[in-house]
């Protein structure tokens, strides 16, 4: 999906008012310095591409983030503010249902959510130069 035509300010507002605290709660008990940010993004569409990938695509050691509250809210926000997103996701969801996994919080998942927090911070500050 091409995130170029999303309403970025509306997604930012959704993140600040409904998603950010759920990411913090997920990470509760871990130090903010515990994980290095290894995933970056260069502009808002790129950030959303990376956010979607980390949130919804199972990775080795962390297969369950898509079932977390912050993931559901992210999915809902993208569907509302990115034209055509919901249509492109329907087929992907049918495939996901076939490999539904139970929610497990692993260190790998914590690291992944830490990366997500960094991507969202970057998304919210699009005028900052890339480090």
């Amino acid at each position: 999906y091409d995130f170029t035509n999303c309403d970025f300010e509306k997604i930012k507002a959704a993140y600040l008012s409904t998603i950010s605290k759920d990411l913090i709660t997920y990470m509760s008990g871990t130090k903010s310095t515990e994980f290095n940010n290894t995933v970056s993004c260069s502009n808002r569409p790129h950030c959303l591409t990376e956010i979607q990938s980390l949130t919804f695509n199972p990775t080795a050691g962390c297969a369950s983030l898509a079932k977390e509250m912050f993931a559901m809210k992210t999915k809902a926000a993208l569907a509302i503010w990115c034209p055509g997103y919901s249509e492109t996701q329907i087929n992907a969801t049918q495939a996901m249902k076939k490999r539904r996994k139970r929610k497990v919080t692993t260190n790998k998942c914590l690291e992944q959510v830490s990366q997500l927090q960094g991507l969202w911070r970057r998304f919210n500050r699009p005028l900052l130069k890339q480090q």
Epitope: T25, M69, K75, I80, I90
Partner: antibody, heavy 117, light 107 residues
Framework: QVQLVESGGGLVQPGGSLRLSCAAS????????MSWVRQAPGKGLEWVSG???????YYADSVKGRFTISRDNSKNTLYLQMNSLRAEDTAVYYC???????????WGQGTLVTVSS | DIELTQPPSVSVAPGQTARISCGGD??????VYWYQQKPGQAPVLVIY???KRPSGIPERFSGSNSGNTATLTISGTQAEDEADYYC??????????FGGGTKLTVL
């Protein structure tokens, strides 16, 4: 303007079935997470069920296995199929748009379901 | 999973400040929303994201959430604020949960 209109409520005997419908207008229905919330006479609000644009569904424990939520995005309509109805299911049923899988920003006017013999 | 506890009733004199609490285990780690419901009407969202007001909601409505308690505050309460108020949050099982409701009486 943004509107949700429920229909299908009425009197039904215990053990019976009923199907509620909710017609949505004024917004891109196919993009939103939609829910049913009920309110028994003189009681508080109880969330019943919700459904994503892609058909992913969620249910309250009290209705799991008896109620089925569905949607037809081409008709901008939300449904609630209620089977094995009990007296405690008697309530006003509200169709609701649940913004960001989270808070309800638009409510219908409600439709009354009475389960009684 | 989380249960939300509200006082059944709160009374306030016109012009005074009304505070309605909503308690739940580690509630501060979740977002809380507040609805106003008048007799015979559907509920209306008055606070979302703990403390944000939807457009059209008067400034006298405010919200806070920390620890195990969220609070809806109505400053300079008016007669028209008399209604039932419900808090709402969500569970770890991805379901929506409401408090039992509080009847606000303006004396």
């Amino acid at each position: 303007q943004v509107q949700l209109v429920e229909s299908g409520g009425g009197l039904v005997q215990p053990g019976g079935s009923l199907r509620l419908s909710c017609a949505a207008s004024g917004f891109t229905f196919s993009s939103y997470y939609m829910s049913w919330v009920r309110q028994a006479p003189g009681k508080g609000l109880e969330w019943v069920s919700g459904i994503f644009f892609d058909g992913t569904t969620y249910y309250a424990d009290s209705v799991k296995g008896r109620f089925t939520i569905s949607r037809d995005n081409s008709k901008n309509t939300l449904y609630l199929q209620m089977n094995s109805l009990r007296a405690e299911d008697t309530a006003v049923y509200y169709c609701a748009r649940q913004q960001y899988f989270d808070h309800i920003d638009i409510w219908g006017q409600g439709t009354l379901v009475t389960v009684s013999s | 999973d989380i249960e939300l506890t509200q006082p059944p009733s709160v009374s306030v004199a016109p012009g005074q400040t009304a505070r309605i609490s909503c308690g739940g285990d580690s509630l501060g780690g979740k977002y809380v929303y507040w609805y106003q419901q008048k007799p015979g009407q559907a509920p209306v969202l008055v606070i979302y994201g703990d403390s944000k007001r939807p457009s059209g909601i008067p400034e006298r409505f405010s919200g806070s959430n920390s620890g195990n308690t969220a609070t809806l505050t109505i400053s300079g309460t008016q007669a028209e604020d008399e209604a039932d108020y419900y808090c709402q949050s969500y569970t770890n099982a991805l379901s929506t949960v409401f408090g039992g409701g509080t009847k606000l009486t303006v004396l």
